[in-house]
């Protein structure tokens, strides 16, 4: 039961995390205009990975996409790549984990297969989360660097008379969404990996003896096989019957249809 809960919770947490990563990637507020230096601005600038926007005090917002690939900073391209890799890995992980869920029965899938799939999805979620955290962190670092560079030459004199205020950018909401979402995906992945340990059936300690007419061999028949998960021994001992894939945990009544909720 604990395994099912851990696996289910891991799936849900990862699902929320990946949804957050997608949201963060699509959001326009990766960097927002720092209003500390000009709190009375009637024009507010903010930028995303895909476009930059200007919101006027009139309420009108104009967004322009970055319609070039070559002209964009390498760091921005790297952040885009990390976020996309995170989304793709996360999406594949979700797909894999759906079939690995203990509460869903698909044909006569063995526990070992489910354990492997759970581990695979868990690793994918961990990498996905790390990609998102890395992407957001790279962007944040880029912002901090640019912020202090623009602070250093905040005012550039025009003819020694007129002052032009340089627009500085600070952390936007998308960064915080990305960090939280990446963290959730990472946690969900760890939970899936932990659940995998409980899913993997142990080799049983008893032997099934078969007698033959020739009377010369004693066959050792394992009740199941132990999946190579890389983890230590299971905390919960599970007996398997007839060498089949069903454990005691599965001897509950299941709904007639697969429950994907």
């Amino acid at each position: 039961m604990a395994v099912t809960a851990c696996q289910g919770l891991g799936f849900v947490v990862s699902l929320i995390g990946i949804a957050g990563i997608i949201a963060a990637t699509c959001m326009d507020q990766w960097s927002t205009q720092d209003l500390y230096n000009n709190p009375v601005t009637a024009v507010f600038n903010y930028q995303g990975l895909w476009r930059s926007c200007v919101r006027e005090s009139s309420g009108f917002t104009e967004c322009r996409g970055y319609f070039t690939l070559l002209g964009l900073p390498a760091m921005l391209q790297a952040v885009r790549a990390l976020m996309i890799v995170g989304i793709v890995l996360g999406a594949i992980g979700l797909l894999v984990s759906i079939f690995a869920l203990k509460c869903i029965r698909i044909g006569s899938m063995e526990d070992s297969a489910k354990a492997n799939m759970t581990l695979t999805s868990g690793i994918m979620f961990i990498v996905s989360g790390l990609c998102a955290i890395a992407g957001v962190s790279v962007f944040a670092n880029m912002l901090v660097t640019n912020f202090w560079m623009s602070t250093a030459n905040m005012y550039t004199g025009m003819g020694g008379m007129v002052q032009t205020v340089q627009t500085r950018y600070t952390f936007g909401a998308a960064l915080f969404v990305g960090w939280v979402a990446g963290g959730l995906t990472l946690i969900g992945g760890v939970m899936m990996c932990i659940a995998c340990r409980g899913l993997a059936p142990e080799e049983t300690n008893y032997k099934a003896v078969s007698y033959h007419a020739s009377g010369h061999s004693v066959a050792y028949k394992p009740g199941g096989f132990k999946a190579s998960t890389g983890f230590g021994s299971n905390t919960k001992n599970k007996k398997t019957y007839d060498g089949g894939a069903h454990t005691e945990d599965e001897l509950q009544s299941y709904p007639s249809k697969h429950d994907y909720v």
Epitope: N38, Q47, S58, G59, T164, Q166
Partner: antibody
């Protein structure tokens, strides 16, 4: 057709208050911010502040803060400006204007003339 | 506050002439986010409210005759009337739309001979 209809002229005593209105028609009132501008006789234009009818959130020019109060009523599509502690310096024509793209005031009311005299 | 300085304060021209009036701001009105200058030009005829002519320094408001042209960037702006008509008799104001408080220039009074 977009129209901003302002209330009639006011003759008030020094120290008194005056409340003028600006009724909007021909567009969705909550979609545009309403600004107020002061013009003294034979002089230039001075920005007082604005009211966002959607949020009822005002913003004031520091010079008029505390004396000007901007409000709006969605049900009647009307913006209001109340001016308190009036002096002769407040004798002017007060315009309401709709803010559009580019932060430009594209439609203006005909103006409310306020005369402060004892 | 951004100070808007208009010059000249008044102009007297004959119909058909080309007219240029200037507006200078104490701070740049160029927004880096969209590379637009937040400067607006208004025309105020005697006894009337101001009328929007040009916004974003050079974008003509719909219905405004094409003889009116706005130009400039950063801190220096110009309003040009290519061929002045009798109905152009008015005071022309430039306005900072970039930061609060919105500030207006003192105006340029255009008179026709």
């Amino acid at each position: 057709e977009v129209q901003l209809q302002e209330s009639g002229p006011e003759l008030v005593k020094p120290g008194a208050s005056v409340k003028m209105s600006c009724k909007a028609s021909g567009y969705t009132f909550t979609n545009y911010i309403i600004h107020w501008v002061k013009q003294k006789p034979g002089q230039g234009l001075e920005w007082i502040g604005y009211i966002n009818p959607y949020t009822d959130g005002p913003k004031y020019n520091e010079k008029f803060k505390g004396r000007a109060t901007l409000t709006s009523d969605k049900s009647s599509s009307t913006a209001y400006m109340e001016f308190s502690s009036l002096t002769s310096e407040d004798s002017a024509v007060y315009y309401c204007a709709r803010l559009n793209r580019g932060n430009a005031m594209d439609y203006w009311g005909q103006g409310t003339s306020v005369t402060v005299s004892s | 506050d951004i100070v808007m300085t208009q010059s000249p304060s008044s102009l007297t021209v004959t119909a058909g002439e080309k007219v240029t009036m200037n507006c200078k701001s104490s701070q740049s009105l160029l927004n880096s986010g969209n590379q637009k200058n937040y400067l607006t030009w208004y025309q105020q005829k005697p006894g009337q409210p101001p009328k929007l002519l040009i916004y974003w320094a050079s974008t003509r408001e719909s219905g405004v005759p094409d003889r009116f042209t706005g130009s400039g960037s950063g801190t220096d702006f110009t309003l040009t009337i290519s061929s002045v008509q009798a109905e152009d008799l008015a005071v022309y104001y430039c306005q900072n739309d970039y930061s609060f408080p919105f500030t207006f220039g003192s105006g340029t009074k255009l008179e026709i001979k």
